[in-house]
């Protein structure tokens, strides 16, 4: 996959808190997988965080602490991509229903989903509270955040020889040293303001010439719509 | 293929440490989750942990406060401690490795385990 | 903690006989449900996971179904090597094995 003060979601830093407002944990408990929310009552996550039971938590910064702005929902629908595959990771995407509808505000909104598909070197925000050491175990209690680049499809291959289909792409940077890692899946990538990744695989963490591996969202567009529109 | 070899003392006096380390060999140790699970004579199997080669590490939680779990990639190796050991712990203690395709999915979740080493025998007396 | 019943705890079979053993979790936990087979004196082997999915190498005679909280495996024609103790496995959350049901000839 499924990791120093310096090093965070590896390589990244600290998000200004309530930031990254349409960010959401998942916990089963404890946080497992990270999530976007789409609209008022679904988040969008990887098919392989997929459990029988989700609470999804907002408004989320340091998730080992009621800071006064979460709000905590349990999943009514949990719907995996039909064509997921654990094996390959492909397809790897994943809608859950809140019990409820989330209560929009300043700190908890929602994400656009994708108009076109994610254009190499467009600069992109990952974020989650997955491991912030590339060797070794740091879990941090507050959100990471990290800024990083779309590589070509070609440079994503030669990365990843017969592993990268067409709905997965690659963010980050060759040389190593800043990545998402375990803890993160699920979670966004967002550029320009919309949401084109979600946090699905990648060899270790910030090795050099294994980038991170995310699902190309674009592709599922109308999947998200059609999945939403029958189960609402 | 891969094969998983378990090592350490067979006898452990009672409130000292067990250390165990398992030797991977056929493969690499790298980018995969790797598990120790115990079984005590003619009883059932109870799962004790799980460390990834990053180093992240998941316990039982029943055992959580007396198991550490570590990983030397350069050996090829992961270990086992538990510390305040007593009888109850005497068992053929196995490692394994996990059942996901690459270990290379970014969730903290679990699988299984596809690939077992053969056990070793650790008895907790005075 | 996700507990598994597992039944029976043992049973007696004849050679070519179909055998069937059932798991039961506590709580939902989806599909993420694995089988093993434990010979005397060895390590488990898995032989589905997933609750359906078949490991490479494992004989076809192997089966198992079910999701949620109830699960079957079933051997369709049971072999003399297939004698051994058989564990079920949840992976929902954590890990936890059911009791074993251990497998006999007739």
């Known amino acids: 996959a499924p990791f120093d003060d310096d090093d965070k979601i590896v390589g990244g830093y600290n998000c200004e808190e309530n930031s990254v407002p349409y960010q959401v944990s998942l916990n089963s408990g404890y946080h497992f997988c990270g999530g976007s929310l789409i609209n008022e009552q679904w988040v969008v996550s990887a098919g392989h965080c997929y459990k029988s039971r989700i609470q999804v938590r907002l408004g989320e910064h340091n998730i080992e602490v009621l800071e006064g702005n979460e709000q905590f929902i349990n999943a009514a629908k949990i719907i995996r991509h039909p064509q997921y595959d654990r094996k390959t990771l492909n397809n790897d995407i994943m809608l859950i229903k809140l019990s409820s509808r989330a209560v929009i505000n300043a700190r908890v909104s929602t994400i656009s989903l994708p108009t076109a598909p994610p254009a190499t070197g467009t600069k992109c925000l990952i974020s989650g509270w997955g491991n912030t050491a590339s060797s070794g175990a740091d879990y941090p209690d507050e959100l990471q955040c990290l800024d990083a680049p779309v590589l070509s499809q070609a440079k994503c291959e030669a990365s990843y020889p017969g592993k990268i289909t067409s709905n997965m792409f690659c963010v980050g940077f060759l040389e190593g040293g800043k990545d998402s890692c375990q803890g993160d899946s699920g979670g966004p990538v967002v550029c320009n303001g919309q949401l084109q990744g979600v946090v699905s695989w990648g060899d270790g963490c910030a090795q050099k010439n294994k980038p991170g591996v995310y699902t190309k969202v674009y592709n599922y567009v109308k999947w998200i719509k059609n999945t939403i529109a029958a189960n609402s | 293929q891969v094969q998983l070899q378990e090592s350490g003392p067979g006898l452990v006096k009672p409130s000292e440490t067990l250390s165990l380390t398992c030797t991977v060999s056929?493969?690499?140790?790298?980018?995969?989750?790797w598990h120790w699970i115990r079984q005590p004579a003619g009883k059932g199997l109870e799962w004790i942990g799980r460390?990834?080669?990053?180093?992240?590490?998941f316990y039982n939680p029943s055992l959580k406060s007396r198991v550490t779990m570590s990983v030397d990639t350069s050996k090829n190796q992961f270990s086992l401690k538990l510390s305040s050991v007593t009888a109850a712990d005497t068992a053929v203690y196995y490692c394994?490795?996990?059942?996901?395709?690459?270990?290379?999915?970014?969730?903290?979740?679990?699988?299984?385990?596809?690939?077992w080493g053969q056990g070793t025998t650790v008895t907790v007396s005075s | 903690d996700i507990q598994m019943t597992q039944s029976p705890s043992s049973l007696s079979a004849s050679v070519g006989d179909r055998v069937t053993i059932t798991c039961q979790a506590s709580?939902?936990?989806?599909?993420?449900l694995n089988w093993y087979q434990q010979k005397p004196g060895k390590a488990p082997k898995l032989l589905i996971y997933?609750?359906?999915n078949l490991e490479t190498g494992v004989p076809s005679r192997f089966s198992g179904s079910g999701s949620g909280t109830d699960f079957t495996f079933t051997i369709s024609s049971l072999q003399p090597e297939d004698i051994a103790t058989y564990y079920c496995?949840?992976?929902?959350?954590?890990?936890?094995f059911g009791g074993g049901t251990k497998v006999e000839i007739k």
């Open positions: 997933d609750a359906s």
């Open positions: 056929g493969g690499s140790i790298s980018s995969h989750y």
């Open positions: 496995q949840q992976t929902d959350n954590f890990i936890t």
């Open positions: 460390i990834h080669t990053s180093g992240s590490t």
């Open positions: 394994a490795r996990d059942l996901t395709n690459y270990g290379w999915s970014k969730s903290i979740r679990f699988y299984g385990m596809d690939v």
């Open positions: 709580q939902d936990i989806s599909n993420y």
